[in-house]
């Protein structure tokens, strides 16, 4: 409970300001989502399984993370793509793979790209193939902001809890 | 010293709860390890050299980071692989490179993959070659949990303090 | 304002130690810079545009981030490189791409690499091509330290706010 074992004034402060940070307190918004492995041709984020979690106000709605309070957050995501041998047919042109974390905010009427990673792979030249993309950064976000992802190459995702994930935490 | 220069009640709180966070206080578990460059065919983590450190309870045992207190931690790691030019007769079969951060916990009798990155490189196709892998995410960890890494392609690691590292910090 | 709505002793503590962390307080050094898209053959960091910011003491001087107070910081950066289609006679010699975050400190008379990622791409073999590099880690930094980047392959950078960035935040 907030304030347990604190001196009276500190206990009172903690009760009034439960977000006051005692190290390792879990009272800081954080989320870690994993890609649903049962959905092979889409990327649906899940919070109620494996190592995934939503904490202290973060929620998942319409496949987007909803920012609980205004502040600076570190936002991150990873995807891993793969392709089998001889997957392309009559082309040697590359496959475009991309992963982006986007912000939808009341301040803007469109999705703003926050983090983008891109790759061209040449399945006709190199098979089987595997490619990982990771990115993360700090952003000033506002309560109610929506964080979502857009991925090019979804059929090629390697969907497991340790390979495809998306998260954020307040600083 | 904890509590120096604080008002009496805050000083008492800080003494009793030394983890209470004053910005830039170093009283938050954090660790940054680097791969030992003197060990060419293994990946041994070191904390007592270069920019590496263990702080506020983190320890390194059996090449694993021991989590000092329960809470949410951001865990990260990077590796860089390279390969020299091969003979013209080099096979065109791919080389599988992978790096994984694993959790060994009293809750599970096996290593759980937390972060995984993978790559196929084709040494016969592209030589010399270089490839970097990075990943990081937030996880709910328990005191006594062990964080370790597993790497495929260790002989190809570019072992330097800025290329091969492993770390974690409490949020 | 620091201390508003706190109990007297906590208010006094917060006034004396304004950096004391109330969750989501912005009183924690953080910075996120983006590569200036108007400068095609150099990588100039900007803080006054798009999602970029400097907070609580961080400043940008001579294209370097100046560390405002001693402590542990998470430092990160990303770059994305691309290359256009070449003629069939394009050289098959590789292009070396690298990105490094460096520390210049009063403790050392030279730039120390903190984070390094590297890649060889073969433009004659695979065109067009795209490649992303990301890295980040926790470092013990000292007030006045300078964080900068060095990039090989600057003409190939894909300069946008979501693809090329550099940042840090105090833990």
């Amino acid at each position: 409970l907030p304030g347990v074992g604190l001196t009276p004034s500190a206990a009172q402060t903690a009760r009034q300001h439960p977000k006051m940070h005692l190290a390792h307190s879990t009272l800081k918004p954080a989320a870690h989502l994993i890609g649903d492995p049962s959905k092979q041709n889409s990327l649906l984020w899940r919070a109620n399984t494996d190592r995934a979690f939503l904490q202290d106000g973060f929620s998942l709605s319409n496949n987007s993370l909803l920012v609980p309070t205004s502040g600076i957050y570190f936002v991150y995501s990873q995807v891993v793509f793969s392709g089998k041998a001889y997957s392309p047919k009559a082309t040697s042109s590359p496959l475009y793979l991309a992963h982006e974390v986007q912000l939808f905010s009341s301040q803007y009427p469109f999705h703003v790209p926050l983090l983008s990673s891109q790759k061209m792979v040449y399945p006709g030249l190199q098979e089987p193939w595997l490619h990982s993309m990771y990115h993360g950064a700090a952003f000033q976000l506002t309560q109610g902001d929506q964080l979502s992802t857009h991925t090019d190459g979804i059929p090629h995702l390697v969907l497991s809890p340790s390979t495809v994930f998306f998260g954020a935490f307040a600083l | 010293l904890p509590g120096v220069g604080l008002t009496p009640s805050a000083a008492q709180t800080a003494r009793q709860h030394p983890k209470m966070h004053l910005a830039h206080s170093t009283l938050k578990p954090a660790a940054h390890l680097i791969g030992d460059p003197s060990k060419q065919n293994s990946l041994l983590w070191r904390a007592n050299t270069d920019r590496a450190f263990l702080q506020d309870g983190f320890s390194l045992s059996n090449n694993s980071l021991l989590v000092p207190t329960s809470g949410i931690y951001f865990v990260y790691s990077q590796v860089v692989f390279s390969g020299k030019a091969y003979s013209p007769k080099a096979t065109s079969s791919p080389l599988y490179l992978a790096h994984e951060v694993q959790l060994f916990s009293s809750q599970y009798p096996f290593h759980v993959p937390l972060l995984s990155s993978q790559k196929m490189v084709y040494p016969g196709l592209q030589e010399p070659w270089l490839h970097s892998m990075y990943h990081g995410a937030a996880f709910q960890l328990t005191q006594g949990d062990q964080l370790s890494t597993h790497t495929d392609g260790i002989p190809h690691l570019v072992l330097s303090p800025s290329t091969v590292f492993f770390g974690a910090f409490a949020l | 304002l620091p201390g508003v709505g706190l109990t007297p002793s906590a208010a006094q503590t917060a006034r004396q130690h304004p950096k004391m962390h109330l969750a989501h307080s912005t009183l924690k050094p953080a910075a996120h810079l983006i590569g200036d898209p108007s400068k095609q053959n150099s990588l100039l960091w900007r803080a006054n545009t798009d999602r970029a910011f400097l907070q609580d003491g961080f400043s940008l001087s001579n294209n370097s981030l100046l560390v405002p107070t001693s402590g542990i910081y998470f430092v990160y950066s990303q770059v994305v490189f691309s290359g256009k289609a070449y003629s069939p006679k394009a050289t098959s010699s590789p292009l070396y791409l690298a990105h490094e975050v460096q520390l210049f400190s009063s403790q050392y008379p030279f730039h120390v690499p903190l984070l390094s990622s590297q890649k060889m791409v073969y433009p004659g073999l695979q065109e067009p091509w795209l490649h992303s590099m990301y890295h980040g880690a926790a470092f013990q930094l000292t007030q006045g330290d300078q964080l900068s980047t060095h990039t090989d392959g600057i003409p190939h950078l894909v300069l946008s706010p979501s693809t090329v960035f550099f940042g840090a935040f105090a833990l």
Partner: antibody, heavy 114, light 113 residues
Amino acid sequence: EVQLVESGGGLVQPGGSLRLSCAASGYTFSSYWIEWVRQAPGKGLEWVGEISPGSASTNYNEEFKGRATFSADNSKNTAYLQMNSLRAEDTAVYYCADGYHGYWGQGTLVTVSS
Amino acid sequence: DIQMTQSPSSLSASVGDRVTITCKSSQSLLYSTNQKNFLAWYQQKPGKAPKLLIYWASTRDSGVPSRFSGSGSGTDFTLTISSLQPEDFATYYCQQYYSYPRTFGQGTKVEIK
């Protein structure tokens, strides 16, 4: 079911322009190149070029560079071929194709005549 | 540009015949590092779009009858129809996708004798 459906063909005057559409359905569109191939009446197949919808990268047959422009709208899963300065010899059935999966559209006829 | 030359330009055959069409490229289509030939064969019937039959010179596309086979390497390639069926009367094209621009052979028309 995977489908590529071309539209926008018809009669055009010499010197005129035309924009052809290729609407894709039944598969994820953005990662795979869309190729444009044409076939003049009674003749063989001629490759015009290709576009990667996700990255907007393009490759053109030099014979069409300057007159052909590829574009794509990922939100509509549609690729476009804009042809300018049309001549009688541009009369052909224009096909879009996805070579990665081996899909072809049914084609759309462009007739350039006064 | 890589030139693709098919022969014959047309042929007459009967149902049940074994038919062979050849395709020569002006440079090798073999990618040495993975030992694959960047060549496809298409079938086209009047008023219809081309249909992919064979890719990587010898891999049959899904749903293509086993009587169709592709062979060859480097610059010389062959499409074989082991036992011609009524629905096989069509024009056949080879295409290289080794380099830009992609190029097609001029076509081989298979007619009923």
